[in-house]
Interface confidence: low
Amino acid sequence: LDDACISNPCHKGALCDTNPLNGQYICTCPQGYKGADCTEDVDECAMANSNPCEHAGKCVNTDGAFHCECLKGYAGPRCEMDINECHSDPCQNDATCLDKIGGFTCLCMPGFKGVHCELEVNECQSNPCVNNGQCVDKVNRFQCLCPPGFTGPVCQIDIDDCSSTPCLNGAKCIDHPNGYECQCATGFTGILCDENIDNCDPDPCHHGQCQDGIDSYTCICNPGYMGAICS
């Protein structure tokens, strides 16, 4: 038999062979072509079975092939690959990156926020410190610098300045926001009520010696005198 392929009847890089039974050529076409001499394009996008593009990619027919226009988040000849948006390490501050379809989500470490966990959370934003406490922002927490007289995580505790019983001689202690006040028992004076009021000044005893007591005095009368004030 003559070589039917001598005239190169097959196109588009097809394989030509001579049929040993009838001497005719046989073209074995590459993918994407059809017809006796492989000159007809196969419209892969119009094939009845299914869209060759996965994940709802748009199929575009080309000469001898097709290509897929992929939706955001997919890649590959058939949109078969979910793009790993975490590959570029977009999350900052040791956040965990979760790959999503067409995007990513950063799971921030406590104390950080933002799409990329790039922002430090300002825990002082809500003004958590009371009683004029000064808020200092820290990572995932805050610290309150309390003014004198206050304590606690948010300066909410009024320090009881009376707890150390500073007032003496039975005085009543009154706690104030920034200190205390001693209300002295009768007969005492001073900031801490530690001073006994001198009831002998001025001297009440007319003819005798005055002895000071607590909120009282005693007159020791000279001979010949008597009475409370030796009068």
Epitope: D89, D94, T96, L107, C108, P110
Partner: antibody
Framework: EVQLVESGGGLVQPGGSLRLSCAAS????????MSWVRQAPGKGLEWVSV????????YYADSVKGRFTISRDNSKNTLYLQMNSLRAEDTAVYYC????????WGQGTLVTVSS | DIVLTQSPATLSLSPGERATLSCRAS???????LAWYQQKPGQAPRLLIY???SRATGVPARFSGSGSGTDFTLTISSLEPEDFAVYYC?????????FGQGTKVEIK
């Protein structure tokens, strides 16, 4: 295949120490936060500690703070938990787990603290 | 600390029935950073759901998570024999990371 394998558990007396190891494979260890979670016999899960991918940040449960130390060697793909001053209540199966929520778990290693 | 309370403690159901497990947080879980795990006796836990509603790789579609803020739910639409296990919720919103006490799903 993503895999975590713990080792180092055993019986120890109260006040003693143990060092747990967790060998990781099948994923980029140096890019993942790693955690330790424990489970006392017949009880629920309890988070113990987590370490950032670089090892720069560590966090602990109050129950172990000051006694346990988490660390990692990214060149060896290994996570560690140094446990000191062990107490009876530390008796549990200790799991290492990937990330801050746990996509992958090891098989666990039993730590028994008893005299 | 964010305390997670799971209910019920035990759920007795038959295969094919629907299981609804609840997880309530003592305060709002930031960004719905809540996960669900399944644990069978003698095995390590297995991640089912993260981000309150996203199914982990290889988890059957009968498992679904929902909820936000302080109330979260894990639903198993039709129980298979292999689903009888203990289920835990976990928040990873704030330190300390906390787990619920677990819900045991047992065969009725």
């Amino acid at each position: 295949e993503v895999q975590l394998v713990e080792s180092g558990g055993g019986l120890v007396q109260p006040g003693g120490s143990l060092r747990l190891s967790c060998a990781a494979s099948g994923f980029t260890f140096s890019s993942s936060g790693m955690s330790w979670v424990r489970q006392a016999p017949g009880k629920g899960l309890e988070w113990v500690s987590v370490i950032a991918s670089s090892g720069s940040n560590t966090y602990y449960a109050d129950s172990v703070k000051g006694r346990f130390t988490i660390s990692r060697d990214n060149s060896k793909n290994t996570l560690y938990l140094q446990m000191n001053s062990l107490r009876a209540e530390d008796t549990a199966v200790y799991y290492c787990a990937r990330s801050i929520f746990y996509t992958t778990w090891g098989q666990g290693t039993l730590v028994t603290v008893s005299s | 600390d964010i305390v997670l309370t799971q209910s019920p403690a035990t759920l007795s159901l038959s295969p094919g029935e629907r299981a609804t497990l609840s997880c309530r947080a003592s305060q709002s879980v930031r960004s719905n950073y809540l996960a669900w795990y399944q644990q069978k006796p003698g095995q390590a836990p297995r991640l089912l759901i993260y981000g309150a509603s996203s199914r982990a790789t290889g988890v059957p579609a009968r498992f679904s998570g929902s909820g936000s803020g302080t109330d979260f739910t894990l639903t198993i639409s039709s129980l298979e024999p292999e689903d009888f296990a203990v289920y835990y919720c976990q928040q990873y919103s704030n330190f300390p990371i906390t787990f619920g006490q677990g819900t045991k799903v047992e065969i009725k």
